[in-house]
Interface confidence: low
């Protein structure tokens, strides 16, 4: 069971990143699915290595004082959402903006029906060029 | 099937990074090989988690305006090269240069004879000290 | 065999990061253990994908000139410690400090009784908020 999906620009104002089965994507079988373009949902309980990479372009003066944060989150059936992993990068002083990349990855136990998704502080700063931003998992 | 190879400084002007089976490297068997010191080639079709880490040292004033970009690329038999993953980091203002590290990783389907390699915008900026820059894969 | 442990602030002055089995941690079985809160020790020989993520907050003026470096290290029975992976990030000019995240990961052969741990140049700069700093491995 494995998946690798590709970022997609979205007009939605939500902080949850959108993904698509496009380009050189992976969706090994129907035991993992991309739901609503925003979350990877697994049907089998087990240990999964889950990862995300987010490239963004921001400028210190044009952004809030808070850093750019990417969060890998989990929603299990009947449970509240929880943060699994986070990474933070202070905005660049480069103009008009400076690109930076964040990589998250870790091993987690997922229940049947559990979904994982990626949240960012400012989706408008995310880079969607080929290969820059992606999200995936693999069952151990 | 798994491999982990170590960066090697090169006098070549190519943007493709060079690697060696040295130090604490891994080459599990002959189903994955390091070819010409530049690409990992697999003999078996399947899903692979492929990763690369690149540490570099650059300075904004001494570099081009474009960010430092590391790309994980795929060459399949009879197909054109394609980018699987990219990461970008704006150059540091630190002098003489500021070190930064990039990590790339994702799950991809590889065909028999497929090769993966790593491209960077400026190989002269890459750090080759122990552990700083490496490249590998594992078959799921 | 898999583990994922969560960073823990420590009053110790050691450069070795401390970890705990808390929050959304993973410890698949007793073939991998967290020893002294600082190292993951495996009982079985084999290939492991080992990873660490470190988020830190530093300021160029308040820090040494040297970059922030995170090292993934190995101690095998009858061998000296050695560095497997390192990543470096130059300190931010943001005030009071600028957050940055480092991700390390690679495939390595471990012997029975081998331990892996994470070293940083300045543990006081490490961020211990939910999900920011973690460490784990999985057996291939």
């Amino acid at each position: 069971i494995a998946a690798h999906v590709i970022s997609e620009a979205s007009s939605k104002t939500t902080s949850v990143l959108q993904w698509a089965e496009k380009g050189y994507y992976t969706m090994s079988n129907n035991l993992v699915t991309l739901e609503n373009g925003k979350q990877l949902t697994v049907k089998r309980q087990g240990l999964y290595y889950i990862y995300a990479q987010v490239t963004f372009c921001s400028n210190r003066e044009a952004s809030s004082q808070a850093p750019f944060i990417a969060s890998l989150c989990l929603k299990s059936p009947g449970r509240f959402e929880r943060i699994l992993l986070r990474a933070a990068n202070t905005h660049s002083s480069a103009k008009p903006c400076g690109q930076q990349s964040i990589h998250l990855g870790g091993v987690f136990e997922l229940q049947p029906g559990a979904s994982v998704f990626v949240n960012v502080t400012d989706p408008s700063q995310v880079s969607h060029g080929t290969g820059f931003t992606s999200f995936g998992l693999l069952k151990l | 099937i798994a491999a982990h190879v170590i960066s090697e400084a090169s006098s070549k002007t190519t943007s493709v990074l060079q690697w060696a089976e040295k130090g604490y490297y891994t080459m599990s068997n002959n189903l994955v090989t390091l070819e010409n010191g530049k690409q990992l080639t697999v003999k078996r079709q399947g899903l692979y988690y492929i990763y690369a880490q690149v540490t570099f040292c650059s300075n904004r004033e001494a570099s081009s305006q474009a960010p430092f970009i590391a790309s994980l690329c795929l060459k399949s038999p009879g197909r054109f090269e394609r980018i699987l993953l990219r990461a970008a980091n704006t150059h540091s203002s630190a002098k003489p240069c500021g070190q930064q590290s990039i990590h790339l990783g994702g799950v991809f389907e590889l065909q028999p004879g497929a090769s993966v390699f790593v491209n960077v915008t400026d190989p002269s900026q890459v750090s080759h000290g122990t552990g700083f820059t490496s490249f590998g894969l594992l078959k799921l | 065999i898999a583990a994922h442990v969560i960073s823990e602030a420590s009053s110790k002055t050691t450069s070795v990061l401390q970890w705990a089995e808390k929050g959304y941690y993973t410890m698949s079985n007793n073939l991998v253990t967290l020893e002294n809160g600082k190292q993951l020790t495996v009982k079985r020989q084999g290939l492991y994908y080992i990873y660490a993520q470190v988020t830190f907050c530093s300021n160029r003026e308040a820090s040494s000139q040297a970059p922030f470096i995170a090292s993934l290290c190995l101690k095998s029975p009858g061998r000296f410690e050695r560095i497997l992976l390192r990543a470096a990030n130059t300190h931010s000019s943001a005030k009071p400090c600028g957050q940055q995240s480092i991700h390390l990961g690679g495939v390595f052969e471990l012997q029975p009784g081998a331990s892996v741990f994470v070293n940083v140049t300045d543990p006081s700069q490490v961020s211990h908020g939910t999900g920011f700093t973690s460490f784990g491995l999985l057996k291939l």
Epitope: - | A20, G23, T130 | R82, I83, Q111
Partner: nanobody, 119 residues
């Protein structure tokens, strides 16, 4: 064929110094971590020091820390061990060692050079 040839051993008084050398051939020296191991009379092998491929990293046993210095000259394919403030307990046969390709264990050893510390 891999060859490791140690030299520089001998008899020295406590507090004295010696410099051991190890000439390597038959492999790409600069691609390997190298180490020194010793065996005292009637005892097992003890790791003394290890140096990384380019010499930027060095590790020492607690028993020799601050007294011994490992170094290498990749242009000469030679490994060194500078031993200062020698003690009687440093008496041993010192071996130069090259790691196995997987870097998990050391698979090649020299014939050793005897260091005797005695007044």
């Amino acid at each position: 064929e891999v060859q490791l040839l140690e030299s520089g051993g001998g008899l020295v008084q406590p507090g004295g110094s010696l410099r051991l050398s190890c000439a390597a051939s038959g492999f790409t020296f600069s691609n390997y971590e190298m180490g020194w191991v010793r065996q005292a009379p009637g005892k097992g092998l003890e790791w003394v020091s290890v140096i990384s491929e380019v010499g930027s990293l060095t590790y020492y046993a607690d028993s020799v820390k601050g007294r011994f210095t490992i170094s290498r000259d990749n242009s000469k394919n030679t490994l060194y061990l500078q031993m200062n403030s020698l003690r009687a307990e440093d008496t041993a046969v010192y071996y130069c060692a090259k790691p196995h390709d997987s870097s998990i264990g050391f698979d090649y050893w020299g014939q050793g050079t005897l260091v005797t510390v005695s007044s």
